[in-house]
C-alpha cells in the first residue's frame, strides 16, 4: 500500500513540476524591468525566452517574437534547449509512469517490468527537473550579471555623474515557476526511484528449510528476484516452489505469474 | 467627442491654495491617465505630473512635489490638481491632458486655467 | 532629467516651402523592448492649447494632415513639414513621453512670411 502511496504521489508531484516547466518556458515574465526606487520609465518592460515585451502605462500590451535565431545570445539559446529538454523528457516520463503505476493493470504485465519503468520515469523526471533547475539558473545567474554591470554603467563616466538612465532587469515570475516546477519534478522523481525499490521484490535472507511431506521428500529452496540483477529478464530466479511459507505483505506486495497462493 | 472642460480663470492670493478642475466626458473616464501641464506666459510646457482615475496611482514630477496635489473624483468624472502656498511665480495656465491609449502622449488637451497669483 | 534641446527657433518661411526642425534629446528615448522611440511633437497655436501632431517619433495621429513627417531614432529626431500652409503658424514642441519626468523643448515658433 505504502508502495502504490509512493509511487501515485510520485506521479502527481511530477506531473504538476512539468505543468509548471511547460507554463514558466512558456511565460514572458523571465526578466522584468526593475522598478526598486521608483520606475524610471514610463513603459514597463519584461521578456520571456520567446518574446520581449512592452506594457504602456495606459494598460496597452505589445509583445514582439524572436524573429532570430542567430541573433540571439548563446545563453538564452542554452536556456530555452534545456527547458525543452527538460519538457521532452519530463513528458516520456509521465507517459512510461502511467503505465508503471500500480494501480493500472495492462495485460499481464510483471512486477518487474512495472519497477523498471518505475525506475525509468523517475530517472527522466529527476533530471528533466535537473535540466529545468538549470535552466533557470542559467538565466538567473546572466540577469545578476547583466543588472550589475548596468549599475557599475550608470555611476561611471566624468566624476561619478550619472550619464546614462539605464533601463535594469530582475527576476521574473517565470524564474520562480521554474525554479519550484523542476524542484517538484525531481522530488517526483525521486520518490518514484524509492517506489521502484518496493516494487522490486527482494531477496530473501531465510535460510533453505526442508519441509517433509507425507509421501515425498522435496526441498524447497529459498529464491526470488535478485536485487542486484537490475529488474532485467528473470530466466536465472525464477522461484522454483509453489508455496511456502511468507508474510500477508510479502502476498500483498510481489504478486507474480508463478505465486499461486 | 472627448472634452475636457476647465474654469478659463483663477484669481488666488499670494499664500493661498487652489484647486483648479477639469471634467472629462466623451470617453471613459477611469480608463486614461490624467495629466497637468503648466505653462507660464511666453514660455514653454512643463510636465506637472499624472494620476491614474481608477486607482488613484500617481507619477510627479519632483520640481512640483509638494506645491502640487492631484486628485480625482470618479463619480463626477472630474480630476482635480490642488497648488499650495502661491506665490507670483505659480501664475501660469495650467491644462489637464489626456493621456494616449498606446503610447504615453497627451491625445487631448482641456483649454486650460489661467491661474493668476496677486495681492 | 532629460533634456530636450529644439532648433531652430524662429524659422521664418514661405508659404510652399518644406521646413525641417530638429529635436535632440539627452539621452536615448529608444526603447529596445518594441523598437519604438517615444518622442511626441505637438503643436500650440497662439492662444490655444497644445494638440498632438506625431507620437513614436513616426507615427502620425489621426486627422492630421500628411505633409507632417516625424522621423528620427534614439537621440536625434526631426519633424518635416513638406509644403508649409499660413494655418501651420504655431509653435511646435517635442516631448520626451519616455522617462519620468516627462520633458518638453523649448519650442520651434514657425513664422510665416
Known amino acids: 500500500m505504502a508502495v502504490t502511496a509512493c509511487q501515485g504521489l510520485g506521479f502527481v508531484v511530477s506531473l504538476i513540476g512539468i505543468a509548471g516547466i511547460i507554463a514558466a518556458t512558456c511565460m514572458d515574465q523571465w526578466s522584468t524591468q526593475d522598478l526598486y526606487n521608483n520606475p524610471v520609465t514610463a513603459v514597463f518592460n519584461y521578456q520571456g525566452l520567446w518574446r520581449s515585451c512592452v506594457r504602456e502605462s495606459s494598460g496597452f500590451t505589445e509583445c514582439r517574437g524572436y524573429f532570430t535565431l542567430l541573433g540571439l545570445p548563446a545563453m538564452l539559446q542554452a536556456v530555452r534547449a534545456l527547458m525543452i529538454v527538460g519538457i521532452v523528457l519530463g513528458a516520456i516520463g509521465l507517459l512510461v509512469s502511467i503505465f508503471a503505476l500500480k494501480c493500472i493493470r495492462i495485460g499481464s504485465m510483471e512486477d518487474s517490468a512495472k519497477a523498471n519503468m518505475t525506475l525509468t520515469s523517475g530517472i527522466m523526471f529527476i533530471v528533466s527537473g535537473l535540466c529545468a533547475i538549470a535552466g533557470v539558473s542559467v538565466f538567473a545567474n546572466m540577469l545578476v550579471t547583466n543588472f550589475w554591470m548596468s549599475t557599475a554603467n550608470m555611476y561611471t563616466g566624468m566624476g561619478g555623474m550619472v550619464q546614462t538612465v539605464q533601463t535594469r532587469y530582475t527576476f521574473g515570475a517565470a524564474l520562480f515557476v521554474g525554479w519550484v516546477a523542476g524542484g517538484l519534478t525531481l522530488i517526483g522523481g525521486v520518490m518514484m526511484c524509492i517506489a521502484c525499490r518496493g516494487l522490486a521484490p527482494e531477496e530473501t535472507n531465510y535460510k533453505a528449510v526442508s519441509y517433509h511431506a507425507s509421501g515425498h521428500s522435496v526441498a524447497y529452496k529459498p529464491g526470488g528476484f535478485k536485487a542486484s540483477t537490475g529488474f532485467g529478464s528473470n530466466t536465472k530466479n525464477k522461484k522454483i516452489y509453489d508455496g511456502g511459507a511468507r508474510t500477508e505483505d510479502e502476498v500483498q506486495s510481489y504478486p507474480s505469474k508463478h505465486d499461486y497462493v | 467627442q472627448v472634452q475636457l472642460q476647465q474654469p478659463g480663470t483663477e484669481l488666488v492670493k499670494p499664500g493661498a491654495s487652489v484647486k483648479v478642475s477639469c471634467k472629462a466626458s466623451?470617453?471613459?473616464?477611469?480608463?486614461?491617465?490624467m495629466h497637468w501641464v503648466t505653462q507660464r506666459p511666453g514660455q514653454g510646457l512643463e510636465w506637472i505630473g499624472r494620476i491614474r482615475p481608477s486607482d488613484s496611482d500617481s507619477n510627479y514630477n519632483q520640481k512640483f512635489k509638494g506645491k502640487a496635489t492631484l486628485t480625482v473624483d470618479k463619480s463626477s468624472d472630474t480630476a482635480y490638481m490642488q497648488l499650495n502656498s502661491l506665490t507670483s511665480e505659480d501664475s501660469a495656465v495650467y491644462y489637464c491632458a489626456m493621456g494616449a491609449y498606446f503610447s504615453n502622449s497627451f491625445a487631448y488637451w482641456g483649454q486650460g486655467t489661467l491661474v493668476t497669483v496677486s495681492a | 532629467d532629460i533634456v530636450m534641446t529644439q532648433s531652430p527657433s524662429p524659422l521664418t518661411v514661405t508659404a510652399g516651402e518644406k521646413v525641417t526642425m530638429t529635436c535632440k534629446s539627452s539621452?536615448?528615448?529608444?526603447?529596445?523592448?518594441?523598437?519604438?522611440?517615444?518622442l511626441t511633437w505637438y503643436q500650440q497655436k497662439p492662444g490655444q492649447p497644445p494638440k498632438l501632431l506625431i507620437y513614436w517619433a513616426s507615427t502620425r495621429e489621426s486627422g492630421v494632415p500628411d505633409r507632417f513627417t516625424g522621423s528620427g531614432s534614439g537621440t536625434d529626431f526631426t519633424l518635416t513639414i513638406n509644403s508649409v500652409q499660413a494655418e501651420d503658424l504655431a509653435v511646435y514642441y517635442c516631448?520626451?513621453?519616455?522617462?519620468?519626468?516627462?520633458?518638453f523643448g523649448s519650442g520651434t515658433k514657425l513664422e510665416i512670411r
Open positions: 539621452q536615448t528615448l529608444l526603447n529596445r523592448g518594441n523598437q519604438k522611440n517615444y
Open positions: 516631448q520626451n513621453d519616455y522617462f519620468f519626468p516627462f520633458t
Open positions: 466623451g470617453y471613459t473616464f477611469t480608463t486614461y491617465w
